[in-house]
């Protein structure tokens, strides 16, 4: 098997990516400048640490989490980094254009980098459903479309529903999941004969995927608290997320054992289920008043995640062509919905408590937000899927799905592994 890129893609990718990068540099040159105000340096460092946590989550956490394929681990990690780097640049510009451009120039702050990293994270969640079936040129398209769709979704939700940064970013779980699933649905499904082994997991890549899960597990409290405006909210968010992910780990490992006839633990279940609590509490992490509630949520989320990992892959593999180990998409879609439902329950309790008879209206607003997120995710995902199917991108042949050798130079290997 040739280790070279197909000649046409070799021309297409560098030209496409470098032209795009040049365009981004020009946009930054003409339309952006740094926040000139002098800040308290200690505060600046503390603020940077939140952004650093998010970058670690994205680059190492999601990068390695998706690297469990036996013959696609290199590509998973490196392509994730590529998408993150590109996604952050475009997200900073887009957020700036959408929120502050009328004033003339986009002011870049640590907060805008934080927002951009979270927007780029959306792509890294979605791409789990298509990694191995697309090349870098196609991934560039996916990054541009998804970041643009998410940016516009956030602006629309912010303007129409008057939601804050945290609330409108927490739709990221549902948005990213449905976007990824709809892109996957558009791509060629069946794995041809002879390539079934490539989408299987192997011990060393599975270990690196577990490393990714551990990084995500450690930094999930930072993700859930990054966009909250007061110290008390951030503190509550950190505590509640921590309790939820702690319980979901215990649930994931014990639930995985329970789900297996011989009581064995599945690596794939554990990779995703350890994060379940963090996703489920995301929307309401700052509002949960007691640790035990966050822990119960972590428990429920862990069970849903393990249950989903047991029963959904068959369906996803048949309908969407998503391999068994790429379970982030449906995992996040279920858990994201759980998180949104929990918030709606809190909303009902709040309006009943206030006794102002606005329950229906408030719930309708929240359901409207969620529906809008799902609809935009599905529509932009389908659009992306259709774009990725264009011949211009020279997509990998089905026989070369999940194969690092299509993209990477391995000097010590003549053919195969």
């Amino acid at each position: 098997m040739s280790s070279k890129y197909p000649r046409s893609v070799r021309r297409c990718l560098p030209l496409w990516a470098l032209t795009l990068e040049a365009a981004l540099i020009l946009l930054f040159y003409f339309f952006t400048h740094y926040d000139a105000s002098l800040e308290d340096q200690k505060g600046l460092v503390a603020s940077y640490q939140v952004g650093q946590d998010l970058t670690v989550m994205a680059a190492i956490g999601l990068g390695f989490l998706t690297s469990s394929f036996r013959r696609h681990s290199w590509s998973s990690v490196a392509f994730n980094l590529f998408m993150l780097a590109l996604g952050v640049q475009w997200a900073i510009l887009l957020d700036g254009f959408l929120s502050q451009f009328p004033s003339g120039k986009v002011v870049i702050t640590l907060f805008s980098i934080r927002l951009a990293t979270m927007s780029a994270l959306s792509v890294l969640i979605s791409v789990d459903a298509v990694l191995g079936k697309v090349n870098l040129a196609q991934l560039v398209v996916m990054v541009l479309v998804e970041v643009t769709a998410l940016g516009n979704l956030r602006m629309v939700i912010s303007n129409i529903f008057n939601t804050d940064y945290h609330m409108n970013m927490m739709h990221i779980y549902v948005f990213a999941a449905y976007f990824g699933l709809s892109v996957a649905w558009c791509l060629p499904k069946p794995l041809p004969e002879g390539t079934e082994d490539k989408d299987q997991t192997a011990t060393i890549p599975s270990l690196s995927a577990m490393l990714g899960a551990l990084f995500l597990w450690m930094f999930w409290p930072s993700f859930n608290s990054a966009l909250l405006r007061s110290p008390i909210e951030r503190k509550n968010a950190v505590f509640n997320t921590y309790y939820a992910v702690a319980v979901s780990v215990v649930t994931a490992i014990s639930g995985s054992s329970l789900a297996h006839p011989q009581g064995k633990i599945s690596k794939t279940y554990v990779h995703s289920a350890v994060l379940a609590g963090g996703v489920a509490v995301g929307t309401s992490c700052h509002l949960i008043p007691s640790p035990w509630l966050a822990m119960v949520l972590g428990l429920v989320a862990g069970l849903i995640s393990v249950g989903g990992a047991k029963y959904l892959p068959g369906c996803c593999n048949r309908v969407l062509g998503i391999p068994h180990s790429s379970i982030m998409g449906y995992n996040f879609s279920l858990l994201g919905l759980l998180g949104e439902i929990i918030y709606i329950v809190l909303l009902v309790l709040d309006t009943v408590g206030a006794g102002n008879g606005m329950i229906g209206f408030q719930v309708l607003l929240s359901i409207g937000e969620l529906s809008l997120a799902i609809v935009i995710a599905l529509m932009s995902g389908l659009l992306t899927g259709l774009l990725l199917n264009l011949k211009i991108w020279k997509a990998p042949h089905e026989a070369k799905y999940f194969d690092d050798q299509v993209f990477w130079k391995f000097p010590h290997l003549a053919v195969g592994f």
Partner: antibody, heavy 125, light 105 residues
Amino acid sequence: QVKLLESGGGVVQPGRSLRLSCIASGFTLRNYAMHWVRQAPGKGLEWVAGIWFDGSNKNYADSVKGRFTISRDNSKNTLFLHMNSLRAEDTATYYCARERAIRGISRYNYYMDVWGKGTTVTVSS
Amino acid sequence: VMTQSPSSLSASVGDRVTITCRASQSIRSSLNWYQQKPGKAPKVLIYAASSLQSGVPSRFSGRGSGTDFTLTISSLQPEDFATYYCQQSSSSSWTFGQGTKVEIK
């Protein structure tokens, strides 16, 4: 005693710059988001700008976007408002105010609980 | 945009006074009421549409959610003659109503 004291106001020509300061006492500034609010003579209150507790995020009213910059130095317990390209319509009393966050069941509620006495800015040629 | 009505009203001591504030779009319960006396800084009365700030007399009350809100003074006292402002804190850019001046009849 919790107090906010503004300073830096005065008479300035259109197009020039001015920097307002607000020193907090009786509480730790780094635990609170802060705001600037102004009131033109004989007119109502107008929110000007806000900054998060850690300085990571800043928001501005459309009327001052691109001209005014809010910043803070938590180590000195001080809030700033840098005003550039001043116009006659920026003439007002400028108040700094502390934001309080209270948890409701489904969202946090924010309001300004402590206000300074204000400093007067007059933009005139 | 926050629209307050009336812009001014005359009332006597002991009267029940109601001021309304309407938001151009839903702000849920993110509405606060402030009182300002001439030459003084504003003072918060009600936050989150209906919660009374500590130290504020119980004759002040707030109601509403979504787009329509009211501030009620159940029995007007001499010290209540002032200008009242509503303010939304729902979006990242806060806005005030234009104010309602309560004068002695």
